[in-house]
């Protein structure tokens, strides 16, 4: 059960996650005109990833496309790459883990098949929430920097008379999204790696037993098990991952001291 | 068709308050902004107060404190409350909406004329 | 405040001569977002209300003839007439409109030579 909600609780947790992703990555309001020290201003500008915009105070809006991809700066296109990036992966991941997600049942889907769908999904979020975290962090670093270097040299003065200042850009709504919906995103595929873990199927010992005519003892075989002696640190049975399912004819039994009734 | 019509003007003692208004037709306040912008006898334009279409206001810096810029959108009508009235405030008021864009003031009333004497 | 300066104070300018109105703002009124300019011209005639000519330092308002013309960028603008006509005799002014208070040039008075 606690499995089972771990699972769906990383799943909800990366969707709204991606969902800030994706907004974050629509978002306009990347960088923000800084107002501190500045005169009042009646026109505010603020940029996004794909477009800038600048609002007057009577309400109009106008936004401009960056309709040019080389003119860009490098920066920019890498930030926009490592946003894309995290979407795709993480909308992968969250088709993935609808399959994976342990109340929804699909034909005669095996636990162990589901266990390793989840912990790829959960792998996918969580690299996708690290693309949504650097990328945002990206463009944070490159607005500080942008920021001191205008500051240094905010004021150009013509003759001491005219002042020309030079717009200087601050943290945009759309960061704040960014860090938390890829914080929420890496939060969801931890959460659904560890629900991996609880994921394959608790069986019974003893559930295959074949019984072979081998001369003066019945040997049963475990299926799927390795017998254990009950003493130590290693109290229950350890389920093996074997990459599959098999028939009872094609795993060999060894006789051993616990392979006799 | 667009249209500003400016009253409340009259003489006023100093240190008095008087409300002007300006009943605007052919938009609505929801949608524009409007100035009050004043004009002293053979001087020069002085811009006084705005309101938005939102309903954020701005003013002139020396006129802050005093002056008052309102609206009431129902009744298509802005207002410029204005306190502590000088002998310097005699002036012609206009009202004047904003044309929206570029931030230009495109339609004028004819003015309202206040004096403030003893 | 921004302080907008118009030269010269008055001009005589004969009929059918270009008029040329200055006026420099204290600071730049160009958006680097939009690369507009935030300056309107204004006319005034006695009596009467201004009147809008010229919004974003050069777009004409609708109604307004095409002999006025309204160039220039970030502190220095120019506002011609460039035949002037009978009709134009009136005081010009110039308005920032970037920066709170809006404020206005101190006028330019045009005459008929």
């Known amino acids: 059960m606690a499995v089972t909600a771990c699972q769906g609780l990383g799943f909800v947790v990366s969707l709204i996650g991606i969902a800030g992703i994706i907004a974050a990555t629509c978002m306009d309001q990347w960088s923000t005109q800084d107002l501190y020290n500045n005169p009042v201003t009646a026109v505010f500008n603020y940029q996004g990833l794909w477009r800038s915009c600048v609002r007057e105070s009577s309400g109009f809006t106008e936004c401009r496309g960056y309709f040019t991809l080389l003119g860009l700066p490098a920066m920019l296109q890498a930030v926009r790459a490592l946003m894309i990036v995290g979407i795709v992966l993480g909308a992968i991941g969250l088709l993935v883990s609808i399959f994976a997600l342990k109340c929804i049942r699909i034909g005669s889907m095996e636990d162990s098949a589901k266990a390793n769908m989840t912990l790829t999904s959960g792998i996918m979020f969580i690299v996708s929430g690290l693309c949504a975290i650097a990328g945002v962090s990206v463009f944070a670093n490159m607005l500080v920097t942008n920021f001191w270097m205008s500051t240094a040299n905010m004021y150009t003065g013509m003759g001491g008379m005219v002042q020309t200042v030079q717009t200087r850009y601050t943290f945009g709504a759309a960061l704040f999204v960014g860090w938390v919906a890829g914080g929420l995103t890496l939060i969801g595929g931890v959460m659904m790696c560890i629900a991996c873990r609880g994921l394959a199927p608790e069986e019974t010992n003893y559930k295959a037993v074949s019984y072979h005519a081998s001369g003066h003892s019945v040997a049963y075989k475990p299926g799927g098990f390795k017998a254990s002696t009950g003493f130590g640190s290693n109290t229950k049975n350890k389920k093996i991952y074997d990459g599959g399912a098999r028939t009872e004819d094609e795993v060999q039994s060894y006789p051993s001291k616990h392979d006799y009734v | 068709q667009v249209q500003l019509v400016e009253s409340g003007g009259g003489v006023v003692q100093p240190g008095r308050s008087l409300r002007l208004s300006c009943a605007a037709s052919g938009f609505t306040l929801t949608s524009y902004g409007v100035y009050w912008v004043r004009q002293a006898p053979g001087k020069g334009l002085e811009w006084v107060a705005v309101?938005?279409?939102?309903?954020?206001?701005n003013y002139a810096d020396a006129l802050k404190g005093r002056f008052t810029i309102s609206k009431d959108n129902s009744k298509s009508t802005l207002y410029l409350q204005m306190n502590s009235l000088r002998a310097e405030d005699t002036a012609v008021y206009y009202c004047?909406?904003?044309?929206?864009?570029?931030?230009?003031?495109?339609?004028w009333g004819q003015g309202t004329l206040v004096t403030v004497s003893s | 405040d921004i302080v907008m300066t118009q030269s010269p104070d008055s001009l005589a300018v004969s009929l059918g001569e270009r008029a040329t109105i200055n006026c420099k703002s204290s600071q730049s009124l160009l958006n680097s977002g939009n690369q507009k300019n935030y300056l309107a011209w204004y006319q005034q005639k006695p009596g009467q209300p201004p009147k809008l000519l010229i919004y974003g330092a050069s777009t004409r308002e609708s109604g307004v003839p095409d002999r006025f013309t309204g160039s220039g960028s970030g502190t220095d603008f120019t506002l011609t007439i460039s035949s002037l006509q009978a009709e134009d005799v009136a005081v010009y002014y110039c308005q920032n409109d970037h920066f709170f208070p809006f404020t206005f040039g101190q006028g330019t008075k045009v005459e008929i030579k």
């Open positions: 309101v938005w279409a939102g309903g954020n206001t």
């Open positions: 004047a909406r904003d044309r929206g864009r570029l931030l230009a003031m495109d339609y």
